[in-house]
Amino acid sequence: GPVWRKHYITYRINNYTPDMNREDVDYAIRKAFQVWSNVTPLKFSKINTGMADILVVFARGAHGDFHAFDGKGGILAHAFGPGSGIGGDAHFDEDEFWTTHSGGTNLFLTAVHEIGHSLGLGHSSDPKAVMFPTYKYVDINTFRLSADDIRGIQSLYGDPKENQRLPNPDNSEPALCDPNLSFDAVTTVGNKIFFFKDRFFWLKVSERPKTSVNLISSLWPTLPSGIEAAYEIEARNQVFLFKDDKYWLISNLRPEPNYPKSIHSFGFPNFVKKIDAAVFNPRFYRTYFFVDNQYWRYDERRQMMDPGYPKLITKNFQGIGPKIDAVFYSKNKYYYFFQGSNQFEYDFLLQRITKTLKSNSWFGC
């Protein structure tokens, strides 16, 4: 069956049952997710706005899928297997009386079962398993998954240490002063510089030595990790972020709805599957897109590619290339190109490299 193809999963509580305090609902749902994260490499984070992987809904009767609830008793809840859209979502029948204890229907116990479905588990034939199809109250203070539950979920996602065996574990923060550090994408955002790497970004505020590391998902929960290119149009308060053949638009630090969109809407030919780096030059009002050993130039006013492109990077940016990882614009005259652990300050008026630096030189290393 389907599984989530990532380890960082977001959830959102769409609405709250009036049967319980909001804090108790939040706690029950958080603890239910924790039951599964304790035995897998999965990490769950709650978001309050935007599109979460798993939407938690309290509803009665017909509620937007084929599986209308049936009033009190009978079906308590249902959840969809991993996937986009309704995939992963967990629906709880509002006609039940939801509680924190043994009276009514215990939300925590029901949520553990439903989240099991949200993660891809089917029902178990073991009566001791939480994935057994019928509800039975057990003491929530001593509740534990059965061996069958653990076997089932670990067959899908591995054990908690599984992600540490990956060659580049997506749960470890890269060492900022590692001389071999490279970046996936770099862009200015107002007076700050964002450096993207894996699922992290560092924030450098101009002229201040201090930098802070953050999860991309903590600022923009709906965005993926592994951003590959980024550029800013400061006059419009817009930042464009690229991964694979998609891009996201951030306005005033908020993700715009209806994204991601295809990079081909910029006018790239079909063979372009991803962007390596991008930079906007406000003097010319043009964006430069770097793809392998070539680059395109895009007119942001006319919203179309300039004719005569692509061109070779090495031909028009002396000393740069053949490929680059990241680039940003600064101080009205420089592009900062990143290639692996090296960085090149490039004066685009003189059309030459003016300084060679380590990629992490911005961090006082």
Partner: antibody, heavy 122, light 103 residues
């Protein structure tokens, strides 16, 4: 490439019966919910029926409940719609459509067949 | 029972125009709304699912938004091939359709 091919349509008299088939290829048929959707001439789309991966549960629109039966044969990768007690208002193009996999249906129809025309007329 | 009301039922527009079609549910359906395009004599095709997610292969001029009860399908710049009928849908309920015609 996902393909759905309906067959079995034709002209039938009111009160008569017809069995539609939908042959699926290009994907593993058995884990997916499947549906029938119809469209009367010049009208909009109307969902008719849906069936779970292993032949249940089944759902029906009120307009056809008790007259139509949806079924599937996973070994033949085929979906069926048995239509009895046909009425003039059942005249339509009948499409089969694929949904997501899993125990519950999303009602998200990502692939459709080309349709087969059923005409109920005396 | 849930009902879907789609508007307008027909719409005339020109190539290059920005077009918006709306769909309203009589109760919350969260983001469980899909949009389909159907051309004469053809089967419908999925454009947008889960209110705002673009189906693979669909041009980015199509976008969807909304949650709860109010949803919109927007075509940012109409192309000749976009003249068709558009349907919103949630589980077993389709909107009445919007026929988009050349002005």
């Amino acid at each position: 490439e996902v393909q759905l091919l309906e067959s079995g349509g034709g002209l039938v008299q009111p009160g008569g019966s017809l069995r539609l088939s939908c042959a699926a290829s290009g994907f593993t048929f058995s884990p997916y919910w499947m549906h029938w959707v119809r469209q009367a001439p010049g009208k909009g789309l109307e969902w008719v029926s849906g069936i779970g991966p292993s032949g249940g549960p089944t759902f029906y629109a009120d307009s056809i409940k008790g007259r139509f039966t949806i079924s599937r044969d996973n070994s033949k990768n085929t979906l069926y719609l048995q239509m009895n007690s046909l009425r003039a208002e059942d005249t339509a193009v009948y499409y089969c459509a694929k949904d997501i996999r899993g125990p519950y249906s999303s009602g998200l129809f990502d692939y459709w067949g080309r349709g087969t025309l059923v005409t109920v007329s005396s | 029972d849930i009902q879907m009301t789609q508007s307008p039922s027909s719409l005339s527009a020109s190539v290059g125009d920005r077009v918006t079609i709306t769909c309203r549910a009589n109760q919350s359906i969260y983001t469980y709304l899909n949009w389909y395009q159907q051309k004469p004599g053809k089967a419908p095709e999925l454009l947008i699912y889960a209110a705002s997610s673009l189906q693979s292969g669909v041009p980015s001029r199509f976008s969807g938004s909304g949650s709860g009860t109010d949803f919109t399908l927007t075509i940012s710049s109409l192309q000749p091939e976009d003249f068709a009928t558009y349907y919103c849908q949630q589980a077993g309920i389709f909107g009445q359709g919007t026929k988009l015609e050349i002005k």
